[in-house]
Amino acid sequence: ALDTNYCFSSTEKNCCVRQLYIDFRKDLGWKWIHEPKGYHANFCLGPCPYIWSLDTQYSKVLALYNQHNPGASAAPCCVPQALEPLPIVYYVGRKPKVEQLSNMIVRSCKCS
Amino acid sequence: ALDTNYCFSSTEKNCCVRQLYIDFRKDLGWKWIHEPKGYHANFCLGPCPYIWSLDTQYSKVLALYNQHNPGASAAPCCVPQALEPLPIVYYVGRKPKVEQLSNMIVRSCKCS
């Protein structure tokens, strides 16, 4: 699987999950989140050659098409597969509230 | 929706479904499919700017990150959303067989 265990410990050039830290204020302009100040969101990057973690029948066909037509602009793309939530603390006035923000962290990628 | 109805009738530059015809023999090297000789597989292409048909909370966050950090390599990607099957005819010896190949045709795209 193209997950953090594999991708973070390798020099994989093909589609893999990459490290990305997002600072809520600086990178998103969000002042409303109190904790954490930012988080490891990660992102997916890398080419999707034929047989590389292909998602559907269609993506397999497209990768094969790409192999036969190397100059084509039609190719599978490296996108998130498994996403995890992020617990945050924000304030409603002076009162702290805890919330789970769903689908915020990329754990693995796929070619789609 | 970034579907064939909208995308094929517009000059949309952002993520949209595009026309792509795949010839089974020429483009895939598949000789085993008797009918059809090829099909309109379509593909997804175009940038995913902030607010453009974003799939999950993560893709919205990543697009917002991208807006604040225009030079970043982390950005959502245009990939298939709705896929449809393709009925085909192939031969087992001299005996024709009809089969549905699932997830073969792109009907719409999303930014993931």
């Epitope: 998103l28 409303w32 924000y90 409603v92 | 902030y50 919205k60 917002l64």
Partner: antibody, heavy 120, light 108 residues
């Protein structure tokens, strides 16, 4: 420049619902919380609630809980306020306003207001 | 909920005079959870002061805010003709956000 443009005036019957829209432009929509404030004719200001775009976290004044729903559509930079089970005392001008950044905060830009009249 | 009481209800002054508007909270708001707005007939409110004493962008220097705890003041050092309007204080320390009932500043 920052602009909040609201939908037009509405006349509703008691017991029905109303949905008011507020389209934002001129700034990064998802970076600020949007609050809704109402003002009955000749009266003061009353906070309805606020919504955080992207994550769709909403906070409501207790008196409106169960009757009001605030949502944000990031694809169109639009926030919606839906108020159900309308009463005659809900007749007011409803304003959307951008907060300075926190869930409860001062409001630096306001829409032009939407008059909702509830009458039988 | 936190009740804000503004005084006076109406203030009659002439251009050039100094205006002092008061806002009292039913419980302590600390030092930075109060805002002041100006509203003219048929218009939306306009933010003047936030954090009790910070002037919003574009607001003239004649407007100033002060106070902490339960007592807050908006001062207009020298009234201009365009300053005659209704003024509201707002607290955002606790949910729900509440507003004072307003002070009407009218020309004497």
């Amino acid at each position: 420049q920052v602009q909040l443009v609201q939908s037009g005036a509405e006349v509703k019957k008691p017991g029905s619902s109303v949905k008011v829209s507020c389209k934002a432009s001129g700034y990064t929509f998802s970076s600020n919380v949007i609050s809704w404030v109402r003002q009955a004719p000749g009266k003061g200001l009353q906070w309805v609630g606020g919504v955080i775009p992207i994550v769709d976290i909403a906070n409501y004044a207790q008196r409106f809980k169960g009757r009001v729903t605030l949502t944000a559509d990031t694809s169109t930079n639009t926030v919606y306020m839906e108020l159900s089970n309308l009463r005659t005392e809900d007749t007011a001008v409803y304003y959307c306003a951008r907060t300075l950044g926190l869930v409860l905060d001062a409001m630096d830009y306001w829409g032009q207001g939407t008059l909702v009249t509830v009458s039988s | 909920e936190t009740v804000l009481t503004q005084s006076p209800g109406t203030l009659s002054l002439s251009p050039g005079e100094r205006a002092t508007l008061s806002c009292r909270a039913s419980q302590s708001l600390g030092s930075s959870y109060l805002a002041w707005y100006q509203q003219k007939p048929g218009q939306a409110p306009r933010l003047l002061i936030y954090g009790a004493s910070s002037r919003a962008p574009g607001v003239p220097a004649r407007f100033s805010g002060s106070g902490s705890g339960t007592d807050f003041t908006l001062t207009i050092s020298s009234l201009e003709p365009e300053d005659f309007a209704v003024y509201y204080c707002q607290q955002y320390a606790d949910s729900p956000i509440t507003f004072g009932q307003g002070t009407k500043l009218e020309i004497k």
